[in-house]
C-alpha cells in the first residue's frame, strides 16, 4: 500500500528554492517531494518522499523515477519514487540514480568505457546489426569520451536530462536518447493529452524553457483538436 | 509568487461532511498537481490526496472511499469532499500546489503551501 511506501513524513533540510512553474495556468497538477513550509519562503524536503502523482519520468526530480509505489499495485497510480542505488534492482535506466544506470536489471555505474559500449549494443539491438543510415542519421552512436566528465553537448547520447548541459534535456531521437535543446518562446512543444503517450514519439521534442508553458496557439483556438498546434508561451 | 488559500474548515460532528476549497492564485501561477496534506496537534504532516492535471487521482489509505479530491481548471480551485469524518480527522489541513523539478535540475519535484485550514471533529 502507499503508506506502507511512506511510512514517514519527517520534515528535513533545506534546497534552493523552485526556480519557476511547469505547466500552464489553471492545469491542477504535477508531483514531488520537497515543499514550501507554509508561512515561509524556503523549501524543505521531506524523509521517505511525499507522494508526487506523474505519468513519466521527466515529471519527477533528476533523483526520481516515475512508477507505482507497490509491486503489482493499482496500475493508474504512478508517484516520483527515489531513484536506486547502485547494486539495487531496475528495470530501465531512468530508475537507477544519476551516474548509473540499468544493465541485465541491476544499477551499475555509468563507468564511460562499459556504458558506451552498453549503449552501443543496446542500439545495434534495436535496430539490427545493419550499420547504414536512417535519414541521414547513422543507426550506431557512440558516447563522448567526456560523457561523465563534462555535461553533454547538443547530441551527445544521454540517459537523463542531467546528463546533459544547462539549456539541454535528454529526449528520444530514433530508438536511442540525446541531449536536444530545451525549447523557447514561440517554438512548438508537444502537449500529451494520454498517459504515456510519449511512447509514440520517435523525435521528442524537449519542454518549455523556466517562464514558459505549452499551450494552444491563440489563432489555433478554433481548429479540430486533433490539429491544434502548441507552442511555448510566458505565463 | 504562488499563493495558495485554503476555506472551508471548521467544527463537525462524527460522521459529517465538509468540503475544502484551495484557490491558487499568482502572476506566474501553474501545477501539474494539486493536494492535500493534513498536521494533527503533535504529528508530523502526512499526505491526504492529490490530483494530477490529467485527472488521476491518488488517496493515503486512511481517507480511500471517504474523501474525493477534484479540480476546476479554469478557476484554479481544487476541493476536498470529505465525508464520514472521524475523530482522528481531526487537524490543519493544507493545500499545495507542485511542479516536477527535473526541468529546472532539481533533485525532487516540490509543492507550494497554503497556511492551512482547521477541520475539527468532534462531538
Known amino acids: 500500500t502507499l503508506n506502507s511506501v511512506l511510512n514517514s513524513n519527517a520534515i528535513k533540510n533545506l534546497p534552493p528554492p523552485l526556480g519557476g512553474a511547469a505547466g500552464h495556468p489553471g492545469s491542477a497538477v504535477s508531483a514531488a517531494p520537497g515543499i514550501l513550509y507554509p508561512g515561509g519562503n524556503k523549501y524543505q524536503t521531506i524523509d521517505n518522499y511525499q507522494p508526487y502523482p506523474c505519468a513519466e519520468d521527466e515529471e519527477c526530480g533528476t533523483d526520481e523515477y516515475c512508477a507505482s509505489p507497490t509491486r503489482g499495485g493499482d496500475a493508474g497510480v504512478q508517484i516520483c519514487l527515489a531513484c536506486r542505488k547502485r547494486r539495487k534492482r531496475c528495470m530501465r535506466h531512468a530508475m537507477c540514480c544519476p551516474g548509473n544506470y540499468c544493465k541485465n536489471g541491476i544499477c551499475v555505474s555509468s563507468d564511460q568505457n562499459h556504458f558506451r559500449g552498453e549503449i552501443e549494443e543496446t542500439i545495434t539491438e534495436s535496430f539490427g546489426n545493419d550499420h547504414s543510415t536512417l535519414d541521414g542519421y547513422s543507426r550506431r552512436t557512440t558516447l563522448s569520451s567526456k560523457m561523465y566528465h563534462t555535461k553533454g553537448q547538443e547530441g551527445s547520447v544521454c540517459l537523463r536530462s542531467s546528463d546533459c548541459a544547462s539549456g539541454l534535456c535528454c529526449a528520444r531521437h530514433f530508438w536511442s536518447k540525446i541531449c536536444k535543446p530545451v525549447l523557447k518562446e514561440g517554438q512548438v512543444c508537444t502537449k500529451h493529452r494520454r498517459k504515456g503517450s510519449h511512447g509514440l514519439e520517435i523525435f521528442q521534442r524537449c519542454y518549455c524553457g523556466e517562464g514558459l508553458s505549452c499551450r494552444i496557439q491563440k489563432d489555433h483556438h478554433q481548429a479540430s483538436n486533433s490539429s491544434r498546434l502548441h507552442t511555448c508561451q510566458r505565463h | 509568487e504562488v499563493q495558495l488559500v485554503e476555506s472551508g474548515g471548521g467544527l463537525v460532528q462524527p460522521g459529517g461532511s465538509l468540503r475544502l476549497s484551495c484557490a491558487a492564485s499568482?502572476?506566474?501561477?501553474?501545477?501539474?498537481?494539486m493536494g492535500w496534506f493534513r498536521q494533527a496537534p503533535g504529528k508530523e504532516r502526512e499526505f491526504v490526496a492529490a490530483?494530477?492535471?490529467?485527472?488521476?487521482?491518488l488517496y493515503a489509505d486512511s481517507v480511500k472511499g471517504r474523501f474525493t479530491i477534484s479540480a476546476d481548471n479554469s478557476k484554479n480551485t481544487a476541493y476536498l469532499q470529505m465525508n464520514s469524518l472521524k475523530p482522528e480527522d481531526t487537524a490543519v489541513y493544507y493545500c499545495?500546489?507542485?511542479?516536477?523539478?527535473?526541468?529546472?535540475?532539481?533533485?525532487?519535484?516540490?509543492?507550494?503551501w497554503g497556511q492551512g485550514t482547521l477541520v475539527t471533529v468532534s462531538s
Open positions: 499568482g502572476r506566474r501561477f501553474s501545477a501539474d498537481v
Open positions: 499545495a500546489a507542485g511542479n516536477g523539478g527535473r526541468q529546472y535540475g532539481h533533485s525532487r519535484a516540490r509543492y507550494d
Open positions: 490530483i494530477r492535471s490529467g485527472g488521476t487521482t
